[in-house]
Amino acid sequence: YDFTNCDFEKIKAAYLSTISKDLITYMSGTKSTEFNNTVSCSNRPHCLTEIQSLTFNPTAGCASLAKEMFAMKTKAALAIWCPGYSETQINATQAMKKRRKRKVTTNKCLEQVSQLQGLWRRFNRPLLKQQ
């Protein structure tokens, strides 16, 4: 999906009002310095591409993020503010529902959510020069 046509300010508002809090809740008990940010993004469409990938694509050691509250709210925000986004998600979501397993918060998932927090922070500051 090409995130170029999303309404970035409205997605930012959704992040600030609720998604950010859910990410913090997920990470509660974890030190903010515990993980190094290794994933970066250069502009808002790129940030959303990376956010979608980390949130919804299962990775080795962390297959369970897509059903977390922050993930479902992210999905809702993208469906509302990115024209045509929801149509691209239908097959993926149906496949995901079939293989839903017991929720386990692994260290790998915590690291991944830490990366997500960094991507969202970068998304919210699009005018900053890339480090």
Epitope: A14, T18, M72, A76, I80
Partner: antibody, heavy 113, light 108 residues
Framework: QVQLVQSGAEVKKPGSSVKVSCKAS????????ISWVRQAPGQGLEWMGG????NYAQKFQGRVTITADESTSTAYMELSSLRSEDTAVYYC??????????WGQGTLVTVSS | EIVLTQSPGTLSLSPGERATLSCRAS???????LAWYQQKPGQAPRLLIY???SRATGIPDRFSGSGSGTDFTLTISSLEPEDFAVYYC?????????FGQGTKVEIK
Amino acid sequence: QVQLVQSGAEVKKPGSSVKVSCKASGGSFSSYAISWVRQAPGQGLEWMGGIIPMNYAQKFQGRVTITADESTSTAYMELSSLRSEDTAVYYCARQLAAALVYWGQGTLVTVSS
Amino acid sequence: EIVLTQSPGTLSLSPGERATLSCRASQNVNTRYLAWYQQKPGQAPRLLIYAASSRATGIPDRFSGSGSGTDFTLTISSLEPEDFAVYYCQQYESSPYNFGQGTKVEIK
């Protein structure tokens, strides 16, 4: 085909609360993408609020709470401190591409002493 | 807060005639964030037009939307018996996402 099924009609006393549910089925769906709209008898549509982003119409601030349970694909709208003017049909509707694409059948809430 | 004002309040027309409904916003609304709905008595509203001019799935092409800025129009090119209903515009530009007060299209 997305379907939104709402809970049944309610009769409430002034000062009490009501909680209306909206269960979704079919399609790719997040119950966080639900907004609530009400319609008083013979009146127009009035947007109440939604979760993404988390905001409510000013007139309902402090009285309305909108929540969702993804595990059951259900959204909820709770309205407290009910008064007779809250007598209305309450609709849930799924937001998509900045419009309310799918609607529930409506739940009539009557506030009467 | 963006206020939407619809006019006329009631439109009395015959089947086959053209209906032109207006929705005026108190502030600029991005065309992406203007929608039109139809509501018949005892039924939930139904989305007709989103993004000011895009027809929702299954909506006949006699319905069309146009406009930008603060002035938007819903046109029904040739009224069918089932088109007599109340029509609402709604903005998604800024919260609260208000509706207009509605235009009733009735049979003359």
